[in-house]
């Protein structure tokens, strides 16, 4: 069950056990108000491990478009501006919840869903197995 | 209104207009069960832009546990292992949707909030600007 | 109240570029995407492409991959259009309009105005 | 890319008739949207997901259809309709248009 003290003003609820139905109000609050000015979209371009963003829609997800990155190169980029195959561009992961319309279609009922999206690239250096 | 051609066994819903309230079961379905075997939890040490992970818990947010990126260094880390302050280590956000407790302590009433998390660090090279 | 407005009436020289700008005001600018379609005199719509002022990411219809460069300010809430190599058949009038990121199934639900650009010798 | 037909190019039309405008894709597409346009005017959002009418507009249009085939239906035409209409798939890339219907109001 869950462990916060309820305060009384919440909505009832009968069935207080995982799983669980919760209600969730779709009207997005952005915390991001003081968004960083420092804060880069053209990362993708400048970063020695370039990356390109794929649009990916799903009209059965919330949110629906979701661009994800994928790495220009196997390699990094060098001070020559040429690709260095002694490092590996490798992609960022992260795990993110979405709300998945459940049953499908359904405009007011959904399940949270943890997908794995690729959200840019770095730069590492490259695990080299010896053989004996 | 409501965009979805509605399949017959969706539950009923009064208010179809924005902003408007959903159900959501939080039985968390995962769609990374082929989770890539490449898929490296040691990035944040091997990358020329290495980072620290920091846990962020806030117990009205679901999930309530984030774990968010700092950049260790200002500059990257070239082929001698020393930081080369010509390029930058820079974070690599998303924004992503989380449930924020709406009113606050209930365990069943949630709003939908947009954060921005740092997940990782790449290299960049600088904008240089050029004075006059 | 939700508004796109784009800047005016162009004329170019073949071979040249325009760039076309949309200032959104009314809305969280990085919560929708900015797609383009263009209209040429008493023809259809033809969509050009779309970019996430969020991301930075940018998918264009293959015709005009190569041509045309869709770009965001987030500071301004401006998107742009840029068209090169311009020609003839390019003369159309070019919209922006506004796709929601979060629920797709509302479509493009604003429009601007539109901004002619006329490309003649 | 997807091909999508209009049904009829024009069509002119009594008030208080029936209107059916046809949209035919050239391979299944999920939903169709519709557009509508005058004169001098930007495209309006007008029926979007197949079925949903856009804020402001009368309860005589519907949409309906799947598959390859979809409908815009006018149960009884008034002036104000007069107008081009096009259909709009996103199901696959390029997006595409309708070559448009145009309504004219005898």
């Known amino acids: 069950g869950i462990t916060i003290p309820r305060n009384p003003g919440c909505p009832n609820s009968e069935d207080k056990n995982f799983p669980r139905t919760v209600m969730v109000n779709l009207n997005i609050h952005n915390r991001n108000t003081n968004t960083n000015p420092k804060r880069s979209s053209d990362y993708y371009n400048r970063s020695t491990s370039p990356w390109n963003l794929h649009r990916n829609e799903d009209p059965e997800r919330y949110p629906s478009v979701i661009w994800e990155a994928k790495c220009r190169h196997l390699g990094c980029i060098n001070a020559d501006g040429n690709v260095d195959y002694h490092m590996n561009s490798v992609p960022i992961q992260q795990e993110i919840l979405v709300l998945r319309r459940e049953p499908p279609h359904c405009p007011n009922s959904f399940r949270l869903e943890k997908i794995l999206v690729s959200v840019g690239c770095t730069c590492v250096t490259p695990i080299v197995h010896h053989v004996a | 209104g409501i965009t979805i051609p509605r399949n017959p066994g969706c539950p009923n819903s009064e208010d179809k207009n924005f902003p408007r309230t959903v159900m959501v079961n939080l039985n968390i379905h995962n769609r990374n069960t082929n989770t890539n075997p490449k898929r490296s939890s040691d990035y944040y040490n091997r990358s020329t832009s290495p980072w620290n992970l920091h846990r962020n818990e806030d117990p009205e947010r679901y999930p309530s546990v984030i774990w968010e990126a700092k950049c260790r260094h200002l500059g990257c880390i070239n082929a001698d292992g020393n930081v080369d302050y010509h390029m930058n280590s820079v974070p690599i956000q998303q924004e992503i949707l989380v449930l924020r407790r709406e009113p606050p302590h209930c365990p069943n009433s949630f709003r939908l909030e947009k954060i921005l998390v740092s997940v990782g660090c790449t290299c960049v090279t600088p904008i240089v600007h050029h004075v006059a | 109240e939700v508004q796109l407005v784009q800047s005016g009436a162009e004329v170019k020289k073949p071979g040249s570029s325009v760039k076309v700008s949309c200032k959104a005001s009314?809305?969280?600018?990085?919560?929708?995407?900015i797609h383009w379609v263009r209209q040429a005199p008493g023809q259809g719509l033809e969509w050009i492409g779309v970019n996430d002022p969020e991301s930075g990411g940018t998918f264009y219809n293959q015709k005009f991959d190569g041509r045309a460069t869709l770009t965001a300010d987030k500071s301004t809430s401006t998107a742009y259009m840029e068209l090169s190599s311009l020609r003839s058949e390019d003369t159309a009038v070019y919209y922006c309009?506004?796709?929601?990121?979060?629920?797709?199934?509302?479509?493009?639900?604003?429009w601007g105005q539109g901004t002619t650009v006329t490309v003649s010798s | 890319q997807i091909v999508l037909t209009q049904s009829p190019d024009f069509q002119s039309v009594t008030p208080k008739e029936k209107v059916t405008i046809t949209c035919s894709a050239s391979?299944?597409?999920?939903?169709i949207y519709w557009f509508q346009q005058k004169p001098d005017q930007s495209p309006k959002r007008w029926i979007y997901a197949t079925f949903e009418l856009a804020s402001g507009v009368p309860s005589r249009f519907s949409g309906s259809g799947s598959g390859t085939d979809y409908t815009l239906t006018i149960n009884s035409l008034e002036a104000e309709d007069a107008a081009t209409y096009y259909c709009h798939q996103r199901s696959s890339y390029p997006w595409t248009f309708g070559q448009g219907t145009k309504l004219e109001i005898k």
């Open positions: 309009t506004r796709y929601y990121r979060y629920e797709s199934f509302y479509g493009m639900d604003y």
């Open positions: 391979s299944s597409i999920s939903y």
């Open positions: 009314g809305y969280t600018f990085t919560d929708y995407e």
